[in-house]
Amino acid sequence: LPRWRQQWSGSGTTSRFPETVLARCVKYTEVHPEMRHVDCQSVWDAFKGAFISKYPCNITEEDYQPLVKLGTQTVPCNKTLLWSRIKDLAHQFTQVQRDMFTLEDMLLGYLADDLTWCGEFNTFEINYQSCPDWRKDCSNNPVSVFWKTVSRRFAETACGVVHVMLNGSRSKIFDKNSTFGSVEVHNLQPEKVQALEAWVIHGGREDSRDLCQDPTIKELESIISKRNIRFFCKNIYRPDKFLQCVKNPEDSSCLSGI
């Protein structure tokens, strides 16, 4: 008889989750020479160990520490790109501007990007039927805690001038409840980070407003300044330029500096 399984509100673990994580790890370590020493089987064991057999509403950052340790990686100063509510454009940007890095360009972020996972208390099984939803079920679920953990670490290790890409088309350009607003902003280290520069991406060329004057950006500036980190903001009016450069990275009009 099939055993009783808790029904959660969120979608279940991504199909072929173990195989996907292992394959991504192998691919990443092949492409990034500085991570060739990483043993992908150990990485998977540490990942699995963080949530398997555990009640999926009681996961802690501590559970992910073995994985975080194995995935330790540093970004050169001035090369960290954070983002909020504009993931695709941020990723397209770092695909072209290869010397800048989002969390998803790092091993751990790359492994988990767009995946869902959870286990069950007292069983070694992975739950492919449903996983806890952050709002409807609980915030301390395996996926949310993972991103909180690795985002905190990513922000803590940033240095120099840190950039963040924000979506100017949203009602809250800076959202205190986003991962950027609730985790990363508060974990930038003032002794290492000289400044945070926000890039506010406009919806199109016809929008000529100064979105750096938006009240939520002023709120971000206040939070950052109180932490003794300088704050700068730039309006970016040309998302079409980003996309043009993504499609034609060799186009010489895309090669000049930021």
């Epitope: 100064d210 750096c212 004057q213 309006n235 040309r238 330029k241 186009d251 009009s253 000049s256």
Partner: antibody, heavy 121, light 105 residues
Amino acid sequence: QVQLVESGGGLVQPGGSLRLSCAASGFTFSSYAMNWVRQAPGKGLEWVSGISSWGSSTYYADSVKGRFTISRDNSKNTLYLQMNSLRAEDTAVYYCAREDGSYMTDYFAYWGQGTLVTVSS
Amino acid sequence: DIELTQPPSVSVAPGQTARISCSGDNIGHYYVSWYQQKPGQAPVLVIYSDSNRPSGIPERFSGSNSGNTATLTISGTQAEDEADYYCQSYNGTYVFGGGTKVEIK
């Protein structure tokens, strides 16, 4: 090397028309947005019009909207500016400029030598 | 649209530092480029994206931008730097400052 050569300028009466051309060489013309910038005698620079790399999007300064039309022929590596209903205040040297830039911003890295348009009766 | 204001002229002795300002409401929120134009010639890009120098432009040219003012600095000015200088920004359309004539005394 990049070269932009404007032509078609001259003396025209108020209300008249003129078509400027800009012949481009030394780069892949179809990869770049192009612009027209003008400079009235003894005055500063004023952006007039721009066109995307494939000509699908066009942009105009308010001062010329409805009177000027920018176009391009990528097969001929040529940029055009059709100027109608010309006024005395349109008198200027017209420069063709290539729009360069990063993902973040845009500027004009290459300019032609300009062609003088004089609107006078 | 953002309005960019430049001083009509700046006078500097050879070898000294010339600073050309370009002011505009919160101009620091926009990227600024600078052009040099000599009489009878087309403009030449000397600074883009606030502080980047195109190849071939001497190191004595530098740029900065914050608050309400962008600045083009020419350190150790030389006779050939005598020209008009224009700042330019972009907010969906291109906007130029009125230009500054740099005179070498």
